[in-house]
Amino acid sequence: DVERTTCPPEKEVHEIDENLIFYKKRELEACVDAALLAAQMDRVDAIPFTYEQLDVLKHKLDELYPQGYPESVIRHLGHLFLKMSPEDIRKWNVTSLETLKALLKVSKGHEMSAQVATLIDRVVVGRGQLDKDTADTLTAFCPGCLCSLSPERLSSVPPSVIGAVRPQDLDTCGPRQLDVLYPKARLAFQNMSGSEYFVKIRPFLGGAPTEDLKALSQQNVSMDLATFMKLRREAVLPLTVAEVQKLLGPHVEGLKVEEQHSPVRDWILKQRQDDLDTLGLGLQGGIPNGYLILDLSVREALS
């Protein structure tokens, strides 16, 4: 913590300006009034403070606002944002997209994924849901940031927003996130024709259930291997060899390359070797011919 000293009269600060760059840490601590700093935050980013000096200014704001900074301060944090921890940001209430844009710009090029994720979360909470304007801001200023939102937050996304989402915005989304987004995408694109629908729904298919994959296999979609590899393992396992062949079309040959990777590996283990052989790819590891497959889950459901 910064040492407490009294401010020499000649060092008293009446406004936030460039003279402050010559102040030592303890002088800044003693001479800068936190309320003045908060009122003139818009000047701070134009002054080339050292990281050490920024630490002192942050400490001042933390003391003034122990429950979290007001948005009027947050909006003008500038490079001071780089000093914020996720715990700091969790205390904020942010509703303005201008504030979000300003801080996203500052964070660019810095390792701040946790802080940015928390900031976006606070914006979504502050605005009540991930509305179209917020989604547009994210796609423009922070590609991929949509996936920093938790599945819980993504649950509040209205289907109308889904149209603004580009494939690259979903690149870092995990299984649960896609599980939440997929039904919304299905709803958003339901009136599109077959081929157009597939192009739109493809990035969301990591959340698709088995029955939807079966339906797609009847539509000559020719799914690429990269998309297939992102499908939920538990959704792929019940697919038959014929269904996977129809789903992948000419890309079915790629199964050989991915033979050792999930979900392909797990799917192979569930298929009869006879059926796998019909693909002519030399896939190995299926259920040997002549073995009886007991589906105990069916017996349980009937009992």
Epitope: S150, E152, L154, T172, G174, P175, R176, D179
Partner: antibody, heavy 118, light 113 residues
Framework: EVQLVESGGGLIQPGGSLRLSCAVS????????MTWVRQAPGKGLEWVSV???????YYADSVKGRFTISRDNSKNTLYLQMNSLRAEDTAVYYC????????????WGQGTLVTVSS | DIVMTQSPDSLAVSLGERATINCKSS????????????LAWYQQKPGQPPKLLIY???TRESGVPDRFSGSGSGTDFTLTISSLQAEDVAVYYC?????????FGQGTKVEIK
């Protein structure tokens, strides 16, 4: 303060039914992903079911078709309806809050014991 | 389903000494797209529900003492208690949340030597 309080456990005969409740305070049950996890006496933890904030549900294979997870938003309560109970369903049943919907659990109730025996 | 296997089943450690628990998953729980390991650790004391200690393999839950740390990636993970305290006597579980159903390890009992 977040609190989850389970109730409804007890002794039940094989083939019988039971409904467990989990009364929630400190957050709204409709806005969170909520889960049931069970623990057989002296054994480890087994995930049972989840209900997403959007209403989607998943079940462990061992309970599929027999158990139903639901919630009553007005009562801020989570439920687990258990039918066709078997001896192997004997366990302490915990309701837990799924943190952010990611799949790990940050708040747990104290649990309610379900004993299936004739 | 992804099978989680912990070792050892039980562990006796002197007060102040380091305790190490291993957890192995039957398939990788590292999601390559976001470089996150979908793995959590819990502590369960007798007669109590589990308590979340670690998530994303290495992120400590708030309020958890910093003697608890998590490490590892892909299929092999470790929970370390750097200096065992009397109140750390419990059963520890790892859990994957990479795919549905989420699955737990069988548990490791930590006792004082």
């Amino acid at each position: 303060e977040v609190q989850l309080v389970e109730s409804g456990g007890g002794l039940i005969q094989p083939g019988g039914s039971l409904r467990l409740s989990c009364a929630v305070s400190g957050f709204t049950v409709s806005s969170k992903f909520m889960t049931w996890v069970r623990q057989a006496p002296g054994k480890g933890l087994e995930w049972v079911s989840v209900i997403y904030s959007g209403g989607k549900t998943y079940y462990a294979d061992s309970v599929k078709g027999r158990f139903t997870i639901s919630r009553d938003n007005s009562k801020n309560t989570l439920y687990l309806q258990m039918n066709s109970l078997r001896a192997e369903d004997t366990a302490v049943y915990y309701c837990a809050r799924d943190s952010g919907g990611w799949g790990y659990f940050d708040y747990w109730g104290q649990g309610t014991l379900v004993t299936v025996s004739s | 389903d992804i099978v989680m296997t912990q070792s050892p089943d039980s562990l006796a450690v002197s007060l102040g000494e380091r305790a190490t628990i291993n957890c192995k998953s039957s398939q990788s729980v590292l999601y390559s797209s976001n470089n996150k390991n979908y793995l959590a650790w819990y502590q369960q004391k007798p007669g109590q529900p589990p308590k979340l200690l670690i998530y994303w393999a290495s992120t400590r839950e708030s309020g958890v003492p910093d003697r608890f740390s998590g490490s590892g990636s892909g299929t092999d993970f470790t929970l370390t208690i750097s200096s065992l305290q009397a109140e750390d006597v419990a059963v520890y579980y790892c859990q994957q949340y990479y795919s549905t159903p989420p699955t737990f390890g069988q548990g490791t009992k930590v006792e004082i030597k």
